[in-house]
């Protein structure tokens, strides 16, 4: 089943997806679509890259925030609404028949929670856990996972877990 990611209405959602370009710099096209990955391509495409750049977005709310030239093609959806809930497909379009990598992730958009973490933890919190409710430092927050963020190590995450408990933050895990 798909991994679930939770975002509050009005915040940013972060849906992780990555691959390892082989050799480095040898990019392949990627598409993100609303709905589970079909046999070919993406249904209801929201963002598409070619071998060099982002070349198609159906809305100004869809962005690539990671370094997609190093394989981080995670999708950021700004200012989410309840209508953004659902399964999204990230398809790495590797040349050859049936070679594509398909990743289905589920976004659950909920109404704003009343409990928010301590402000000093905000940036690290959004980097640490999926399905967590938080408020962003620079604007709307995002739900993220450590696997999609090479700059966050396990020691930081374990430390943050303790800090979260101490701060009284609400954590929801899959």
């Amino acid at each position: 089943s798909e991994v679930e990611y939770i975002a509050e209405v009005g915040q940013n959602a972060y849906l992780p997806c990555s691959y390892t370009p082989a050799p480095p710099g040898n990019l392949v096209p990627v598409c993100w679509g609303k709905g589970a990955c079909p046999v070919f391509d993406c249904s209801n495409v929201v963002l598409r890259t070619d071998n060099r750049d982002v070349n198609d977005r159906t809305s100004g709310r869809y962005w690539l925030k990671g370094d997609f030239h190093k394989g981080d093609v995670s999708l950021t959806i700004e200012n989410v609404t309840l209508a953004d809930s659902g399964v999204y497909c990230c398809r790495i379009q590797i040349p050859g028949i049936m070679n594509d990598e398909k990743h289905n992730v589920k976004l659950v958009v909920i109404k704003p929670a009343k409990v928010t973490p301590a402000p000093t933890l905000q940036r690290d919190l959004t980097s640490a856990f999926p399905r967590m409710l938080t408020t962003g430092e620079h604007g709307p927050a995002e739900t993220q996972t450590p696997g999609s963020l090479p700059d966050v190590n396990l020691t930081q995450i374990f430390t943050l877990t303790n800090e979260l408990r101490d701060s009284g933050a609400t954590i929801r895990t899959a």
């Epitope: 940013n12 480095p24 710099g25 890259t49 982002v54 709310r61 962005w63 690539l64 370094d67 963020l149």
Partner: antibody, heavy 122, light 109 residues
Framework: EVQLLESGGGLVQPGGSLRLSCAAS????????MSWVRQAPGKGLEWVSA????????YYADSVKGRFTISRDNSKNTLYLQMNSLRAEDTAVYYC???????????????WGQGTLVTVSS | SYVLTQPPSVSVAPGKTARITCGGD??????VHWYQQKPGQAPVLVIY???DRPSGIPERFSGSNSGNTATLTISRVEAGDEADYYC???????????FGGGTKLTVLG
Amino acid sequence: EVQLLESGGGLVQPGGSLRLSCAASGFTFSSYAMSWVRQAPGKGLEWVSAISGSGGSTYYADSVKGRFTISRDNSKNTLYLQMNSLRAEDTAVYYCARGSYGTYYGNYFEYWGQGTLVTVSS
Amino acid sequence: SYVLTQPPSVSVAPGKTARITCGGDNIGGKSVHWYQQKPGQAPVLVIYYDSDRPSGIPERFSGSNSGNTATLTISRVEAGDEADYYCQVLDRRSDHFLFGGGTKLTVLG
């Protein structure tokens, strides 16, 4: 043709304020993150601040955080930099720069304005 | 914080190959972009995403990036290539754009 035109520079006393503007044309302004980059006389390039395409997220160099505020008006295709509590070390040519399409931060600076000179001196 | 290190100056004879380096801890894991700036002018993007070349930039300009060093290579150097060159990365840990200190390319003769 992409064009970025900065304005608002000038001479200001230490502790004073100044507001820079960057008028953009030739592209869909809201689809691009934008940045301010400065260059002190005879020195290298220094990134100052960035803002996402929607204006929902802003980022600042440590040297200006708390003193400068970046903003944008997508209906007017204009980028702003409000500079308060100016110091002598803020003296520089300030460039407005456009990031790459569809990327939240902009990643690199594809187009630059010609710059506007800010001089902080008593 | 992350630091990018460039040599202050590089000199090369016309027609030869100039290589300008940009050092940083595991810089190969980041995308590197290069700018050319001539006196009194705004910077111009010459290489982006390590090795891609914007339209209008001659094929003589190329880039590579691995390990702890990114390199801008200018082959068959011309007098008009004389300028300052800057490397740049986005440090996603701090959400800061970073520039190297710049390298002044001098074309001899």
